[in-house]
Interface confidence: low
């Protein structure tokens, strides 16, 4: 079931949609570019992406600091209940933009900006990322991470935009965790009805990769819930 606003938007955002993404970035001074394409079902909350490092590969840091920028940032694919306005779907055809800061427990910082638009029936994502201050002996530069735990992004309106906050946890090869505090501001390119506070439960998985992580496939499932909802559904 979809809301009235989404119903009107279904002519623009179909049941099945593709996207293209281009990322340019640097981490601790190492510059790189990544291109990718993906597809998914915006009203069901699922998406997959195939990504390729086109410049600067193989990357001398863990892929996991990049993975959320492709999918946690691909917000048109979040499933929403009918009574929560889907601010980011409703932003199309004009689209939206976001910026994010990820503060890692060892002082590493990732800052990201992204522009989401619609061209010829496909989403187009342009991403710029900068990672700084990652210790050379830490889990990111030593590539000791093993993917993200499921997480819940707390969403709420403020200053005419939609804010998101997550406490994210990366699994480590030694069995421990590496934590990040993530804050994102999502802003539609036109006036759009903002929802009240709610949560988006997210599970992101690397489904395949080559040995040096220059080709990676990802899958994400994401669903908006009223603030009481748990994350059990993501594991089904």
């Amino acid at each position: 079931m979809v809301s009235k606003g989404e119903e009107d938007n279904m002519a623009i955002i179909k049941e099945f949609m593709r996207f293209k993404v281009h990322m340019e970035g640097s981490v601790n001074g190492h510059e790189f570019e990544i291109e990718g394409e993906g597809e998914g079902r915006p009203y069901e909350g699922t998406q997959t992406a195939k990504l390729k490092v086109t410049k600067g590969g193989p990357l001398p840091f863990a892929w996991d600091i990049l993975s959320p920028q492709f999918m946690y940032g691909s917000k048109a694919y979040v499933k929403h209940p009918a009574d929560i306005p889907d601010y980011l779907k409703l932003s199309f055809p004009e689209g939206f933009k976001w910026e994010r800061v990820m503060n890692f427990e060892d002082g590493g910082v990732v800052t990201v900006t992204q522009d989401s638009s619609l061209q010829d029936g496909e989403f187009i994502y342009k991403v710029k990322l900068r990672g700084t201050n990652f210790p050379s002996d830490g889990p990111v530069m030593q590539k000791k991470t093993m993917g993200w735990e499921a997480s819940s992004e707390r969403m709420y309106p403020e200053d005419g935009a939609l804010k998101g906050e997550i406490k994210q946890r990366l699994k480590l090869k030694d069995g421990g965790h590496y934590d990040a505090e993530v804050k994102t501001t999502y802003k539609a390119k036109k006036p759009v009805q903002l929802p009240g506070a709610y949560n988006v439960n997210i599970k992101l998985d690397i489904t395949s990769h080559n040995e040096d992580y220059t080709i990676v496939e990802q899958y994400e499932r994401a669903e908006g819930r009223h603030s009481t909802g748990g994350m059990d559904e993501l594991y089904k």
Epitope: K97, W98, E99, R100, V101, V109, T111, T113, D115, K128, E158, D159, A161, K163, K183, T185, K187
Partner: nanobody
Amino acid sequence: QVQLVQSGGGLVQAGGSLRLSCAASGRTFSDIAVGWFRQTPGKEREFVAAISWSGLIINYGDSVEDRFTISRDNAKSAVYLQMNSLKPEDTAVYYCAARIGMNYYYAREIEYPYWGQGTQVTVS
């Protein structure tokens, strides 16, 4: 530490325009989010406009939207406030303020640890 030096301001007739500048030093400028606030005697500081570290996210106070424009030039380490269609009620001391990293709550002055010296704008 971030040092902020303001310029611009002065006396202008109603309906006129002014541009305020805020130059920053002491930190990589692209790491800094900047806001503008204003204050009239006996009143609290009022949020005017803010621009994020990336320049991607911009917000305005209700009373200035559609008349004022905030912009940034990272090459010059400066943020500008272009004020058009000025009204007598825009008369105030204007302050630029900065924070390192993401400015998440744009309109809250407590979010900004660094402040410029203030510049007087008088609209007659």
